[in-house]
C-alpha cells in the first residue's frame, strides 16, 4: 500500500471540474474525495483527463466500492467504462436498460469487447430472459449479437422478442441457432396473413422443417434463391420438383447456377431426371428413368 500524501493547501477539490486536469496523479489521489467523485461522475466525461488520471479516479471508486459500483455510479461511467476489466464488471448488478444503453453507447462502432460481453451477460442473467426491449437494444448496437449466443442461451428468448429481430441480425447464425429461433418466429408471426407472414419468417427459414416448406409452397411465396440456399439440406431433400417450383416461383431459374452447391446439388440427386427435365433448366444428375428409388431411411425406421 502506497503511503498517503497530504493534499497541498488550497488544492482540496470542492467539485469535479476541469481544473483537475492540471493535477498530478498524487494530487488527484490526495485531493479528490471518492464520495464526491461518485456523486459527480457525470462530470468526468466532460473533462479531458489523461489515461493516467482516469486510472487514479477508477482506483478511488474501487476503494470506495470494493464489492462493486452501485448502479447510480455505473450509469454515469461514460468513457471510464473502457478502463474497467471484465472482473470489475462481474461485481456489478445492472438492472436498468438505460444504464446498459449508456455504456453500449460508449463502445458504439467498435467490436464487442470482453467488457461489453461481460456487461451484457450480467444484465441478461439479472433479467432472467432476453426480453424484447433488451434484444431491441442489443441488436441495435450489435447486429450479430443474436448469433453469438449458444442454442441453449437462445432458448430463453421469448417468442414476443422475435419481433425485434431484423434480417441482418441473423446473417451469421448457423443452422443450430436457427433451429431454436425458427419455432419461436413461427409462433410469434402465426396470426399474420400469407404474404406478410412470409416476409417476417423468411430470415428464420434456415431452421424450418420439410412440412413447413411444403406448406409454404402452396402459398405462392416466390422464395428467392439466397433464402433457398440457406435452408436445411435435410428439409429440402424430400421436396418434389413440383413443390420446389411452386416454392421458388419465377426464381426457379436460379437453380441452374446453384446446381453444384448444397442443398441444390443433393436435392437434384434425389429427383427423377424426368421430373427435373420438366423445369427446362438443363439440370443434370437426377435418377435415370427406370431406376427404383428406395427410401432407406424409411426402411430403417420400419425395421
Amino acid at each position: 500500500e502506497v503511503e498517503k500524501t497530504a493534499c497541498p493547501s488550497g488544492k482540496k477539490a470542492r467539485e469535479i471540474d476541469e481544473s483537475l486536469i492540471f493535477y498530478k496523479k498524487w494530487e488527484l489521489e490526495a485531493c479528490v474525495d471518492a464520495a464526491l467523485l461518485a456523486t459527480q461522475m457525470d462530470r468526468v466525461n466532460a473533462i479531458p483527463f489523461t489515461y493516467e488520471q482516469l486510472d487514479v479516479l477508477k482506483h478511488k471508486l474501487d476503494e470506495l466500492y470494493p464489492q462493486g459500483y452501485p448502479e447510480s455510479v455505473i450509469q454515469h461511467l461514460g468513457y471510464l467504462f473502457l478502463k474497467m476489466s471484465p472482473e470489475d464488471i462481474r461485481k456489478w448488478n445492472v438492472t436498468s436498460l438505460e444504464t446498459l444503453k449508456a455504456l453500449l453507447e460508449v463502445n458504439k462502432g467498435h467490436e464487442m469487447s470482453p467488457q461489453v460481453a461481460t456487461l451484457i451477460d450480467r444484465f441478461v442473467k439479472g433479467r432472467g430472459q432476453l426480453d424484447k426491449d433488451t434484444l431491441d437494444t442489443l441488436t441495435a448496437f450489435y447486429p450479430g449479437y443474436l448469433c453469438s449466443l449458444s442454442p441453449e442461451e437462445l432458448s430463453s428468448v421469448p417468442p414476443s422478442s422475435i419481433w425485434a429481430v431484423r434480417p441482418q441480425d441473423l446473417d451469421t447464425c448457423d443452422p443450430r441457432q436457427l433451429d431454436v429461433l425458427y419455432p419461436k418466429a413461427r409462433l410469434a408471426f402465426q396470426n399474420m396473413n400469407g404474404s406478410e407472414y412470409f416476409v417476417k419468417i423468411q430470415s428464420f427459414l434456415g431452421g424450418a422443417p420439410t412440412e413447413d416448406l411444403k406448406a409454404l409452397s402452396q402459398q405462392n411465396v416466390s422464395m428467392d434463391l439466397a433464402t433457398f440456399m440457406k435452408l436445411r439440406t435435410d428439409a429440402v431433400l424430400p421436396l418434389t420438383v413440383a413443390e420446389v417450383q411452386k416454392l421458388l416461383g419465377p426464381h426457379v431459374e436460379g437453380l441452374k447456377a446453384e446446381e453444384r452447391h448444397r442443398p441444390v446439388r443433393d436435392w437434384i440427386l434425389r429427383q427423377r431426371q424426368d421430373d427435373l427435365d420438366t423445369l427446362g433448366l438443363g439440370l443434370q444428375g437426377g435418377i435415370p428413368n427406370g431406376y427404383l428409388v428406395l427410401d432407406l431411411s424409411m426402411q430403417e425406421a420400419l425395421s
Epitope: 492540471f22 466532460a46 479531458p48 489515461y51 462502432g109 467498435h110
Partner: antibody
Framework: QVQLVQSGAEVKKPGESLKISCKGS????????IGWVRQMPGKGLEWMGI????????RYSPSFQGQVTISADKSISTAYLQWSSLKASDTAMYYC??????????WGQGTLVTVSS | DIALTQPASVSGSPGQSITISCTGT?????????VSWYQQHPGKAPKLMIY???SRPSGVSNRFSGSKSGNTASLTISGLQAEDEADYYC???????????FGGGTKLTVL
C-alpha cells in the same frame, strides 16, 4: 462581445527571443483556459499547449515541451507564448483560442512570426 | 506528424450533402467525447463548427452536423452553399498523451 486580440506580426533572426500576446475581453478571463495553435505556411493546425489563467497551470504537447513557454497575467487578461531562441522552422502563424468544454470557441486573429537570417 | 486522418479534399455541388471523415484510434476519437470540427477560410482564423462530437455552438447553421462511430468521426454539411468552401479540421483529445490532436485538414470545394 468575446474577443481575443493578438499582438502584431514579428520578423526575427534565428537565436533571438520573442514573446507574443493574446488579450481577452468581453468575458471573465480566469474562467476559461487559453490554448495556442501553430499553423506553418500552407499546412494544417498543430496544438501546442494550454494554460489555466486562474492558477497559471499549463500542459504542453510533447512536440512543443521545452521549445516554448506559455504564461498568463490574469490582472491584465493576457496570455503569452514565448521562445528563448527562435529557429527558422518556427516561422508560422500562431493562434490563441479560448477553450470551452470540448472545443476552442473563440480564436484570436493570429500572429505571424517570421524567422529569417 | 498528423494524428487524425482526413481526406485531403472533397467536393460537392450547391444543395448537395457531403461528409468529411476523421479517423483516429481508440486512444483519441474512439476513446472519449472530445471531437470538434473547425472551418477555416483562407487568411482567416479557424471557426468552431461542432464540439463534443455532435453539438453546435450558437450561430452555426444547422446544416452542419457531427457524428461518431468507433474510431471515426464525421462532419456532414447538407444543402451545400458557396460560402461553405473552406478547409475543415477535426480535433480530438488524446488521453494517453494528454494533448489535443488535429486532423490534417480537408479542402472542401463547392462546384
Amino acid at each position: 462581445q468575446v474577443q481575443l486580440v493578438q499582438s502584431g506580426a514579428e520578423v526575427k533572426k534565428p537565436g533571438e527571443s520573442l514573446k507574443i500576446s493574446c488579450k481577452g475581453s468581453g468575458y471573465s478571463f480566469t474562467n476559461y483556459w487559453i490554448g495556442w495553435v501553430r499553423q506553418m505556411p500552407g499546412k494544417g493546425l498543430e496544438w501546442m499547449g494550454i494554460i489555466d489563467p486562474r492558477e497559471s497551470f499549463t500542459r504542453y504537447s510533447p512536440s512543443f515541451q521545452g521549445q516554448v513557454t506559455i504564461s498568463a497575467d490574469k490582472s491584465i487578461s493576457t496570455a503569452y507564448l514565448q521562445w528563448s531562441s527562435l529557429k527558422a522552422s518556427d516561422t508560422a502563424m500562431y493562434y490563441c483560442a479560448r477553450y470551452m468544454k470540448g472545443g476552442y470557441d473563440y480564436w484570436g486573429q493570429g500572429t505571424l512570426v517570421t524567422v529569417s537570417s | 506528424d498528423i494524428a487524425l486522418t482526413q481526406p485531403a479534399s472533397v467536393s460537392g455541388s450547391p444543395g448537395q450533402s457531403i461528409t468529411i471523415s476523421c479517423t483516429g484510434t481508440s486512444s483519441d476519437v474512439g476513446g472519449n467525447n472530445f471531437v470538434s470540427w473547425y472551418q477555416q477560410h483562407p487568411g482567416k482564423a479557424p471557426k468552431l463548427m461542432i464540439y463534443y462530437g455532435d453539438s453546435r455552438p450558437s450561430g452555426v447553421s444547422n446544416r452542419f452536423s457531427g457524428s461518431k462511430s468507433g474510431n471515426t468521426a464525421s462532419l456532414t454539411i447538407s444543402g451545400l452553399q458557396a460560402e461553405d468552401e473552406a478547409d475543415y479540421y477535426c480535433q480530438s483529445w488524446d488521453a494517453p498523451m494528454g494533448m489535443w490532436v488535429f486532423g490534417g485538414g480537408t479542402k472542401l470545394t463547392v462546384l
